[in-house]
Interface confidence: medium
Amino acid sequence: FERTRSLQDPCSNCPAGTFCDNNRNQICSPCPPNSFSSAGGQRTCDICRQCKGVFRTRKECSSTSNAECDCTPGFHCLGAGCSMCEQDCKQGQELTKKGCKDCCFGTFNDQKRGICRPWTNCSLDGKSVLVNGTKERDVVCGPSPADLSPGASSVTPPAPAREPGHSPQ
């Protein structure tokens, strides 16, 4: 018995979660365990992503959708679909080739990822430093010195570091 080929590809009738099995006369077969097809008309099912090591499973694989991974505590996702996990640092630090390093004087990072950035130069806007910067926080700029009432004082901003070498976002 020779199967008559219709004008329409018979595989187009196979729904998501199945594949068009050439070994079984183009019958729609369910995806095997640990595989999926997210669209209809597929001739193969894709292998499910496995979240191993520093990756952990955020969403289990199903017959119609791939698994989704995120990162274990102490790491954060990078890349489309969390393709990589990168080490967290503490606030006040940034990740360098040699690991987490404290922000240099005059720079800060208020996140667990990203880079250390120079403190804002309040004087550029004609303002004064209201609150000093730290490794974890930018300075807070206040009114210009001329706006301060007599007797009021303002913290003197430190000289800018000549090597901001560290910076985040």
Epitope: L78, L95, T96, I115, P118, E163, P164, G165, S167, Q169
Partner: antibody
Framework: EVQLVQSGGGLVQPGGSLRLSCAAS????????MNWIRQAPGKGLEWLSY????????YYADSVKGRFTISRDNAKNSLYLQMNSLRAEDTAVYYC??????????????WGQGTLVTVSS | SSELTQDPAVSVALGQTVRITCQGD??????ASWYQQKPGQAPVLVIY???NRPSGIPDRFSGSSSRNTASLTITGAQAEDEADYYC????????????FGTGTKVTVL
């Protein structure tokens, strides 16, 4: 689709002013640091300034410090560069660029189309 | 003068391999990102970090890093790879925050 669409370039006399705009779409603008980068005719890329996602942290290259002002309006998904006291050496194509961080490096993952600023009398 | 130094120009035969280097003190601590720029167009990110490619960038582009040098390698160069390539990292002085390399013109023969 992420898009950065620039406007505001043109011809200006030395000592004059110009304001460049960069309209963002296709992403959550308020989540990202934004940058301005320029390229003089036939020359390489020069980084000019960044502004933090909320607008509170700003940094400038020495070449434009005190003359250029970067700002943003997150409600309008827009980035701006106010350029004052323009000089002939400021003639360049100006790009806005979205900044991201990954793999222990800073990256400019999306760029505007560029806008030409010509400073000449 | 830029703090990231690149060779001004290199040429490569179609289908062969070319390596572009970028040298600078800041690269001892930080990885570079790499940008391709064709005439009249905005730059496009091709490599960042140790060796990460944004989606849509062909796998013939790869990156590596050693001491104060970052490298971009194009394995099996295609005609459409002819462009200027710039590295970028942080500055090691306070004059700029980010700095671009001087740029390398890649010609595919």
């Amino acid at each position: 689709e992420v898009q950065l669409v620039q406007s505001g370039g043109g011809l200006v006399q030395p000592g004059g002013s110009l304001r460049l705009s960069c309209a963002a779409s296709g992403f959550t603008f308020s989540d990202y640091y934004m940058n301005w980068i320029r390229q003089a005719p036939g020359k390489g890329l020069e980084w000019l300034s960044y502004i933090s996602s909320g607008g509170s942290t700003i940094y400038y290259a020495d070449s434009v410090k005190g003359r250029f002002t970067i700002s943003r309006d997150n409600a309008k998904n827009s980035l701006y560069l106010q350029m004052n006291s323009l000089r002939a050496e400021d003639t360049a194509v100006y790009y806005c660029a979205r900044e991201d961080y990954g793999g222990n490096s800073v990256l400019f993952d999306y760029w505007g189309q560029g806008t030409l600023v010509t400073v000449s009398s | 003068s830029s703090e990231l130094t690149q060779d001004p120009a290199v040429s490569v035969a179609l289908g062969q391999t070319v390596r572009i280097t970028c040298q600078g003190d800041s690269l001892r601590s930080y990885y570079a990102s790499w940008y391709q720029q064709k005439p009249g167009q905005a730059p496009v990110l091709v490599i960042y970090g140790k060796n990460n490619r944004p989606s849509g960038i062909p796998d013939r582009f790869s990156g590596s890093s050693s001491r104060n040098t970052a490298s971009l390698t194009i394995t099996g160069a295609q005609a459409e790879d002819e462009a200027d390539y710039y590295c970028n990292s942080r500055d090691s002085s306070a004059n700029h925050f980010y700095v671009f390399g001087t740029g390398t013109k890649v010609t595919v023969l």
